[in-house]
Interface confidence: low
């Protein structure tokens, strides 16, 4: 609920149709200069002019500014050499990933093609290629991560082996691994590759599925991490969206000798749903184990007008995942809900990890934000960001790609970068969340004797508020203005109490609060009181009356001045004033009249 849609950082491509925003990543540069960057893949971008090549694709690094057009092209030089390789339309930028703060950057081109010659005939092998660059996005030739060839697929084989493996369709980093998905390997059965480094040692791992079947697309998506099926050892999670026509997710572990072994397969439930085309890992219930979210963007239920789904699988304490999801989230028909899914960190700082789901074909695109709890992911989205409400001309397919988990404006809340196929990327920043940690509403007296009321006093209500900010920012101590409304006898007309100095049973007030604040208000009894049995309910609700801009605007204005109340807290409170009914210490009258009858004589003798 706390992602801001009024102060946006938006970047646009210079060349329309470049697919700028097809892939996105947040990155923190610490070498040469300190800054946060928005990385955007533009896999159909025009080539750096060389006289031969039209299009190669590109990756852009965009600074955090209010300008739309100040992204720089990342310097990846690949010479055109059609006798050896083809870089035309190689889709550089199909994948872009950051290793995290102070880490490296990965960029892939899954359509990069090697050329083999057999006599005078050329054979083309679309093996794909990935590039690792330094934290400053430049090539550091002293870093083995960057100089290593990363060519996992053997182009001397044909499509039945790894000659068409399309390496880099997916990919990413951990602290000591880099990994790549290659869905075209083995007749598009697909494969997952990983390079692991331990000090000076380097190990290559790959997975070849034993089933003799093509067109599974293993490696279409890929995530790697620990606390999945083992507390220390890493598990590779990879989507195969055409497995048995329904899609599947494979969980793989390392074996001696460089093999990855299949530990578990989670299967989709509907033909063509593309289950496994998007995956995310996050510890949703704070049990220390990573849970799994799987997108199936073409899932549908005709009668229910459903289009797209996210399957949520809760980790069973590292033993395995259940075969069936604990939760199935749906999007509206035709929305491709679940085409993208990302673990975005704890955006509202309530101690639980949050999730973003893209539905890029719902209108101009939407991003759904889900929060989690000790029971796992909450079924209802806490916020839905509508592409059409961002006021950006030309924006469409908003939500096609997502990147989170990094606080780029340093307000202690992680932010979210959203890509599209329409040459726009949008940074949505998180607003500070205000928790009302102490709210009391106390009437005195709690039991009212109307005979004791005077013309100036009858019931006094004291209300108190105190707040904190839910992020770990001890310095946030801004004066916030809290608007509140008190209403007596809301459900009765006419009400039986009114506020002193007015004829109204409603009172509107404001607190300006850096600390706990209290206020006392007098209420008077209305004339001609009839109902002295039912208690008088005094209700209170509160809000933050902020002056937000009417329309979204570009800029990096500090969001500290625009906090939001914790929407998970009930924003209402109530108390009741009982009437004195002389019904014992609890003032509750519970009638217990009983009658017994008997025939008696005139002398009051019981007749038998």
């Amino acid at each position: 609920f706390n992602l801001d849609t009024r102060f946006l950082v938006v970047k646009e491509a210079g060349n329309p149709g470049s697919l700028f925003g097809y892939s996105v990543a947040l990155h923190r540069q610490t070498e040469r200069q300190q800054r946060y960057l928005l990385l955007a893949g533009a896999p159909r971008e025009l080539a750096v002019p060389d006289g031969y090549t039209n299009r190669t694709g590109a990756v852009y690094l965009c600074p955090l500014t209010a300008h739309k057009d100040d992204c720089e092209r990342m310097n990846i030089t690949v010479k055109n050499d059609p006798g050896h390789h083809i870089i035309e339309d190689m889709w550089l930028g199909v994948t872009v990933a950051s290793q995290g703060p102070a880490g490296r950057v990965l960029v892939c081109a899954h359509r990069y093609t090697q050329v083999l010659w057999s006599g005078s005939e050329d054979q083309r092998r679309m093996v794909g290629k990935c590039y690792v660059r330094g934290n400053d996005l430049e090539l550091d030739s002293s870093d083995d991560w960057q100089t290593y060839h990363n060519e996992m697929c053997n182009s001397n084989t044909d499509y039945l082996e790894t000659g068409m493996c399309q390496l880099g369709t997916s990919g990413g980093f951990t602290q000591n691994t880099v990994y790549f998905g290659a869905p075209g390997a083995y007749n598009w059965k697909g494969n997952s590759y990983m390079i692991q480094r331990k000090e000076w040692d380097l190990s290559e791992y790959s997975y070849k599925d034993p089933e003799d079947q093509g067109n599974l697309y293993i490696g279409y998506t890929m995530q790697v991490g620990s606390f999945i099926l083992h507390p220390k050892n890493i598990t590779i999670v990879t989507g195969a969206p055409r497995h048995r026509h329904m899609g599947a997710v494979f969980l793989l572990s390392q074996e001696a000798g460089g093999d990855l072994r299949r530990r578990q397969v989670l299967e989709g439930s509907q033909v063509g749903a593309y289950f496994g085309s998007a995956i995310a890992l996050a510890d949703l219930n704070n049990d220390g184990w990573q849970d799994l979210l799987v997108g199936a963007p073409y899932y549908f239920e005709r009668k229910e007008e459903v289009g797209g789904a996210i399957y949520v699988f809760m980790n069973q304490a590292g033993t395995s995942f259940p075969a069936h999801p604990s939760l199935l989230l749906h999007g509206p028909s035709g929305s491709a809900f679940g085409l993208s899914v990302a673990s975005i960190g704890d955006i509202n700082q309530d101690g639980f990890q949050d999730i973003a789901v893209g539905a890029p074909f719902e209108g101009l695109g939407k991003v759904y934000i889900y929060h989690s709890s000790s029971k796992g992911l909450l079924r209802q989205p806490q916020q839905v960001i509508h592409g059409e409400k961002l006021g950006l001309p030309g924006l469409a397919t908003f939500g096609y790609s997502l990147s989170g988990q990094m606080d780029v404006d340093e307000n202690f809340y992680p932010d979210l970068l959203v890509g599209s196929l329409s040459d726009h990327i949008v940074l949505l920043r998180a607003r500070p969340v205000i928790n009302i940690v102490h709210k009391t509403l106390v009437p005195r007296p709690a039991v009212l004797d109307p005979a004791l009321c005077t013309a100036t006093s009858c019931v006094q209500v004291e209300l108190c508020f105190a707040y904190n900010q839910s992020a770990g920012n001890p310095n946030y101590r801004r004066n916030i203005t809290l608007a509140y409304t008190l209403e007596a006898d809301r459900d009765r007309r006419p009400p039986r109490l009114r506020f002193a100095g007015s004829e109204s049973a409603v009172f509107h007030g404001f607190f300006s609060m850096p600390e706990m604040r209290c206020q006392k208000l007098e209420l008077l009894l209305m004339d001609n009181l009839r109902d002295k049995l039912r208690p008088i309910i005094i209700s209170m609700n509160y809000s933050l009356p902020l002056r937000m801009p009417d329309r979204p605007r570009l800029g990096l204005r500090s969001l500290d001045a625009y906090p939001i109340l914790n929407q998970a807290q009930a924003l209402e409170n109530h108390t009741e004033v009982q009437f004195q009914k002389e019904c014992g210490p609890d003032n509750k009258c519970e009638s217990n009249l009983q009658m017994r009858a008997a025939f008696v004589s005139e002398q009051q003798q019981k007749l038998s």
Epitope: F1, H371, L378, R379, Q380, P381, Q382, R490, D491, P535, I537, S539, Q567, A568, Q569, A570, L571, E572, H574, E576
Partner: nanobody, 122 residues
Framework: EVQLVDSGGRLVQPGDLLRLSCTTS????????LGWFRQAPGKEREFVAA????????AYSDSVKGRFTISRDNAKNTVYLQMKSLKPEDTGIYYC???????????????WGQGTQVTVSS
């Protein structure tokens, strides 16, 4: 079986009255806040009204305040939504839901009815 069963929805004319009912079973409804939400075609599910355990306090959305009244009968395990002065924009599927706190966010509600269709049209 723990469930909420919504009923009472139908086609009515603008200005008409309608009462929706939601009957609970499988749990002690007197221990929960009960609320109504609605979803118009192509729109998000929105809060309509909610009522606390004792029935002594209620919450309404601004769009229905003064027109709709939520009430409950704990003896019958039923919550009602009395709707008057109905407008075409009140059209949608109305869902009953339960929560442990009074609030407007759908995320606070953990059990939902199947929904009942209300159509306001002349």
């Amino acid at each position: 079986e723990v469930q909420l069963v919504d009923s009472g929805g139908r086609l009515v004319q603008p200005g008409d009255l309608l009462r929706l009912s939601c009957t609970t079973s499988g749990f002690a409804s007197s221990g929960y806040v009960l609320g109504w939400f609605r979803q118009a075609p192509g729109k998000e599910r929105e809060f309509v009204a909610a009522i606390i355990r004792s029935g002594g306090n209620t919450a309404y959305s601004d769009s229905v305040k003064g027109r709709f009244t939520i009430s409950r009968d704990n003896a019958k395990n039923t919550v009602y939504l009395q709707m008057k002065s109905l407008k075409p924009e009140d059209t949608g599927i109305y869902y009953c839901a339960r929560s442990s706190v009074l609030g407007r966010s759908p995320a606070l509600y953990d059990l939902w009815g199947q929904g009942t269709q209300v159509t306001v049209s002349s």
